[in-house]
């Protein structure tokens, strides 16, 4: 006990009343108003509690403190009086703060600040929206991915800050009258091929595709090593030359020199060089056949093989090269008599006649082009008188029916010996290489040396055998008529043709056989 009559054991936040009692300090309370034992405590009274009599007034908040409380203006408000705290509603001078005025950059870019009571909001500019994680920050709306599909399907959507554009896809262009960019843009495919906007190499043909184009090798060309076909950067080389090489097993310097020239012409070949290249090949062939050199020392069968190889290859090469010529009629002739007539046209519906010194060919233009082939139509005729040397004593193989008919008509008159070549050997070709069964026949008129009386005149074609050689044949060809120095032949296929005089002694006017190619 304190001698002065004050208890020393009073709990924290209390004061003694006398020597045996204590009372809680203002702002604190205990279970009973007078504390008589040290076990009791004084607890802080929360003046801000709901049932409290304290009222701070509007736009303010009550803050409880140890043994007391403070009134403060709510966030977004400030006291006009300048006093940070107050005790009751009568002292309250809180009013709204205009944050937008205080800090003009509050909404950063792309937003407008709007003051509200006690706060502010950011109103985003068109094309922007509030960021969910930071509601005061305006972020670009990506109209292209927002599922709004604002652009026409012929365009692609390009998002930009605060906006978007509808742009024509690569390889497309605005339809007439349409803009390129606004959301009402409508586009159409650009035909790069016909508009000349393509980058195709001259060795290729341009094909338009939706929104793009591709470059395909020209007919008779193949992609250069390691370069795929049908790409924008496809570059091709002519197959024409690579396949025309000396026949296997034939050893001739003269022939090798000819094929060396062909390969030289092919090495740096370009479509624009077609005319010069055709002339140079025929010049080389003309010289080869004028002076066959060691070819003449080869066995007959090998000579026939060489002739077969030359005829076959020449037809392929001329077909390939002539597709690169411009429209019109070409005639070339060479010192030893080789002659070429060529007509190149975009397909026309009429018959075509090619005239040469010793032969005339007539056929329908519509035979010339394979359907779906984009190139021009070509009809060509080559007369190769020099080929006769290599085809001397070449056999004639008749179809069994014709053979039988001849035996019946001229029994016992079939003589030994090969047929005699009366005319120049001619070779006919079209841009279409599928000429085994023409829908309308081709007619040839041959001028030739005189026919020995009572000998059989046959229109024949050179049939390339399986062995790479060949023989004269008459299948699909018929002789329309023959005079002393001319014969008309009609054929349902194309190849190399000639008029032969066969060793049959014709007893009377014979309706049988005469064939052409």
């Amino acid at each position: 006990q304190d001698s002065r009559g004050c208890a020393r054991w009073c709990p924290q936040d209390s004061s003694c009343v006398n020597a045996t009692a204590c009372r809680c300090n203002p702002g604190f309370s205990s279970f009973s108003e007078i504390i008589t034992t040290p076990m009791e405590t004084c607890d802080d009274i929360n003046e801000c509690a709901t049932l409290s009599k304290v009222s701070c007034g509007k736009f303010s908040d009550c803050w409880n403190t140890e043994g007391s409380y403070d009134c403060v203006c709510s966030p977004g408000y400030e006291p006009v009086s300048g006093a940070k705290t107050f005790k009751n509603e009568s002292e309250n001078t809180c009013q709204d703060v205009d944050e937008c005025q205080q800090n003009p950059r509050l909404c950063k870019s792309y937003g407008t600040c709007v003051n509200t009571l006690g706060s502010y909001t950011c109103q985003c500019l068109p094309g922007f929206k509030l960021k969910p994680e930071d509601p005061k920050l305006c972020t670009d709306v990506n109209e292209c991915t927002s599922g709004q599909n604002p652009c026409h399907s012929s365009t692609h959507c390009l998002n930009n800050v605060g906006s978007y554009q509808c742009r024509c896809r690569p390889g497309w262009q605005p339809i007439p009258g349409s803009p390129n960019g606004p959301n009402n843009t409508v586009c159409e495919d650009v035909d790069e091929c016909s508009s000349g906007q393509h980058q195709c190499d001259s060795s290729t043909v341009c094909f338009n595709t939706v929104g793009s184009y591709s470059c395909r090798c020209r007919p008779g060309w193949k992609p250069r090593h390691g370069i795929p076909n049908n790409q924008k950067d496809t570059v091709c080389e002519d197959m024409t030359f690579s396949t025309w090489t000396p026949p296997p097993g034939v050893h001739s310097q003269t022939l090798s020199r000819f094929f060396d020239k062909v390969q030289d012409l092919g090495r740096d070949y370009k479509p624009g060089l077609a005319n010069n290249t055709i002339q140079s090949i025929l010049q080389a062939l003309d010289e080869l056949l004028e002076a066959p050199g060691d070819l003449e020392t080869l066995p007959r069968l090998q000579q026939h093989c060489v002739a077969s190889h030359l005829l076959d290859g020449l037809e392929d090469v001329l077909r390939g090269l002539s597709k690169n010529l411009s429209n019109g009629l070409l005639n070339f002739s060479y010192p030893a008599g080789t002659e070429l007539s060529l007509e190149v046209q975009k397909q026309v519906d009429r018959s075509v006649t090619l005239r040469q010194n010793q032969a005339v060919m007539q056929l329908d233009w519509n035979q010339a082009q394979k359907s779906g082939d984009p190139g021009p139509s070509v009809v060509g005729l080559v007369s190769i008188p020099g080929m006769g040397k290599l085809l001397a004593e070449a056999p004639l193989v008749l179809e069994p029916e014709k053979q039988m008919l001849l035996h019946e008509t001229h029994q016992g008159l079939l003589q030994d010996g090969s047929p005699i070549l009366l005319s120049d050997v001619i070779s006919a070709f079209l841009s279409n290489n599928d000429t085994q069964n023409l829908s309308s026949p081709v007619t040839f008129t041959f001028s030739h040396r005189s026919v020995i009386p009572r000998q059989k005149v046959l229109c024949v074609f050179w049939e390339h055998g399986q062995n790479g050689c060949g023989h004269w044949a008459t299948t699909g060809c018929s002789t329309i008529g023959t005079r002393d120095t001319s014969t008309i032949c009609r054929c349902t296929h194309l190849s190399s043709f000639a008029v032969l005089m066969a060793h049959y002694d014709v007893q009377e006017e014979d309706p049988v056989l005469t064939v052409i190619t």
């Epitope: 060396d260 030289d264 090495r267 740096d268 010069n276 140079s280 010049q283």
Partner: antibody, heavy 118, light 106 residues
Framework: QVQLQQSGAELARPGASVKLSCKAS????????MQWIKQRPGQGLEWIGA????????RHTQKFKGKATLTADKSSSTAYMQVSSLASEDSAVYYC???????????WGQGTSVTVSS | QIVLTQSPAVMSASPGEKVTMTCSAS?????MHWYQQKSGTSPKRWIY???KLASGVPNRFSGSGSGTSYSFTIRSMEAEDAATYYC?????????FGAGTKLELK
Amino acid sequence: QVQLQQSGAELARPGASVKLSCKASGYTFTNYWMQWIKQRPGQGLEWIGAVYPGDGDTRHTQKFKGKATLTADKSSSTAYMQVSSLASEDSAVYYCARGFTAYGMDYWGQGTSVTVSS
Amino acid sequence: QIVLTQSPAVMSASPGEKVTMTCSASSSVSYMHWYQQKSGTSPKRWIYDTSKLASGVPNRFSGSGSGTSYSFTIRSMEAEDAATYYCQQWSSNPLTFGAGTKLELK
């Protein structure tokens, strides 16, 4: 008639570049390769390369790769040769000539003299 | 590359004399061409494809050969024939010229 008209003489400093032109007339520009030939004073003919005007394809001799750039403009039927990093040994007469494998070089320009001097 | 060796390098001939020069190739060549060049002028194509005379070339000139061996002949030398003659091939890249044969009038 076929003509190849070359640009006038050039005087250039070492390290500089010159672009020579060769204007073709009288024939279809894309039917032949355009050849470029160098001839130093008192020396023989030296092939530089060729350009095919139809597609801009070029052929070069190894020595002139990187030294001579060959181009052709179909619209004006003109072939060009740019010679770069000029040195004294580039002083020469440069000819353009129309060429085809089987015919050789049948028409020649009059030549352009290039002198490299500091 | 194909090297063309011309011989002789220099030769002289009197008017009326027959002149022959050769061009030897290090590999086989199928198209050989010859050019004439006079001092201060552009070369002129003289013979092409081994033996064909270019337009305007007198027929006293001729060419022959095959493979690796080619020759150029003037049947009867004339004063106007004095010039340098070059052979040329393009059978393989790069195109090459011979070093030339200088023909002088004796």
